[in-house]
Amino acid sequence: EDELQVIQPEKSVSVAAGESATLRCAMTSLIPVGPIMWFRGAGAGRELIYNQKEGHFPRVTTVSELTKRNNLDFSISISNITPADAGTYYCVKFRKGSPDDVEFKSGAGTELSVRAKPS
C-alpha cells in the first residue's frame, strides 16, 4: 500500500479583497485514519484555520462533502478575504493518537496573496 501523500497543487493563489479564496488539497489515501487540519504559517506559531474534527470556522467552507466515507478532497474556501489573510496555508494530515493526534504529513503549502479591491 502506497504511503499517503498530501497534494496542494497550487504554489500560489491571488485573490481580490472581499472575494473568496479556494485552497485546494487532496489526499492519495485515507490510511492512516485521522483528521485533516488547515494552518496559516508553519512552526509553533501557526494559526489553525480549519479542523475537520471540531470547532466553529464561520468563514471556512469545505469544497467537497467531508462526510462521504471515501472523500479524499479536503479543499477549503475562505470567504471575505482581507489583506490580513495573506500568508502560506498548509493542509496537514494527522494520524489518530491518544490523547492527542499526531502530525503525519503536510502539503507543500499554498501562498495566498491579496490584491486591492477593484475600485
Epitope: L30, V33, P35, E65, L66, T67, R69, N70, K96
Partner: antibody
C-alpha cells in the same frame, strides 16, 4: 437537545416491504452523516447502512445490500430506510444514529420494532 | 470481526477493563456503547477511541493501541450494570462493525 425519533415499524409478512423514518431535531441535520443500526431479539447490535450529510454517498453491509436503501430529506430533517423482500431474519429493533466526524455514533434514537412473521 | 469477552464482573468501587480486539490500529476508530436492557436505546460512552461525551461520567475512559481498544470504568457503580458493545469504523472498507457485547455485572 439532540433528539432522534424512529417510526414506521410494525408487523409484516415475509416478502413484504416497509419504510422506516427517523425524525431529527436539536442539531443541524444537514451537516451530519447518519446510520441505521438494528438489534434482533436476544442478539447484539448490527450496523446496516450509513449515508453522508448531503445524501449522495451510502454504504451497506452485504446482508442488506440490494434489499435496503438508506436515504434522507434534509428539508424535512428526516432519515429513511426502505426495506424490501423482508424475511424473518430482519425482525429487530431498528435504531437511527447520528455519526461523528469519523463515522462512529454519538446519539441514538429509541428504536422502532419490525416484526416479520407469516 | 471484533472480539470482546462475553461477561465481566466486579465489586462496586473496583476498576473494570473491557477489551475489544480485531481491528487494525492504522485504519480503525473505536467506540463504546452502553445498553442497559435489550431493545432500549444504546448510549455512547466513548467515541473516537478515547473521546467521552460531555454527559458521560469521568469514570468512563477509553484507549486504543495495536489491534485492540479498551474501555475502563474506574470506581464502577451498580448503575453501570449493562451490556457494553465496542464498535469499529474501518477506513479501508468504509464499514462499521460491532463486537458481540460484554455483560457487566456489579456484585
Amino acid at each position: 437537545d439532540v433528539q432522534l425519533v424512529e417510526s414506521g415499524g410494525g408487523v409484516v409478512r415475509p416478502g413484504e416491504s416497509l419504510r422506516l423514518s427517523c425524525a431529527a431535531s436539536g442539531f443541524t441535520f444537514s451537516s451530519y452523516a447518519m446510520s441505521w443500526v438494528r438489534q434482533a431479539p436476544g442478539k447484539g447490535l448490527e450496523w446496516l447502512a450509513g449515508i453522508s450529510a448531503g445524501g449522495s454517498d451510502a454504504y451497506y453491509i452485504d446482508s442488506v445490500k440490494g434489499r435496503f436503501t438508506i436515504s434522507r430529506d434534509n428539508s424535512k430533517n428526516s432519515l429513511y430506510l426502505q426495506m424490501n423482500s423482508l424475511t424473518a431474519e430482519d425482525t429487530a429493533v431498528y435504531y437511527c444514529a447520528r455519526e461523528t466526524w469519523n463515522h462512529l455514533f454519538d446519539y441514538w434514537g429509541l428504536g422502532t420494532l419490525v416484526t416479520v412473521s407469516s | 470481526a471484533l472480539t470482546q469477552p462475553a461477561s465481566v464482573s466486579a465489586n462496586p468501587g473496583e476498576t473494570v477493563k473491557i477489551t475489544c480486539s480485531g481491528g487494525d490500529w492504522y485504519s480503525t476508530y473505536y467506540g463504546w456503547y452502553q445498553q442497559k436492557s435489550p431493545g432500549s436505546a444504546p448510549v455512547t460512552v466513548i467515541h473516537s477511541d478515547d473521546k467521552r461525551p460531555s454527559d458521560i461520567p469521568s469514570r468512563f475512559s477509553g484507549s486504543a493501541s495495536g489491534s485492540a481498544a479498551t474501555l475502563t470504568i474506574t470506581g464502577v457503580r451498580v448503575e453501570d450494570e449493562a451490556v457494553y458493545y465496542c464498535a469499529g469504523y474501518d477506513g479501508r472498507t468504509y464499514i462499521n462493525t460491532f463486537g458481540a457485547g460484554t455483560t457487566l455485572t456489579v456484585l
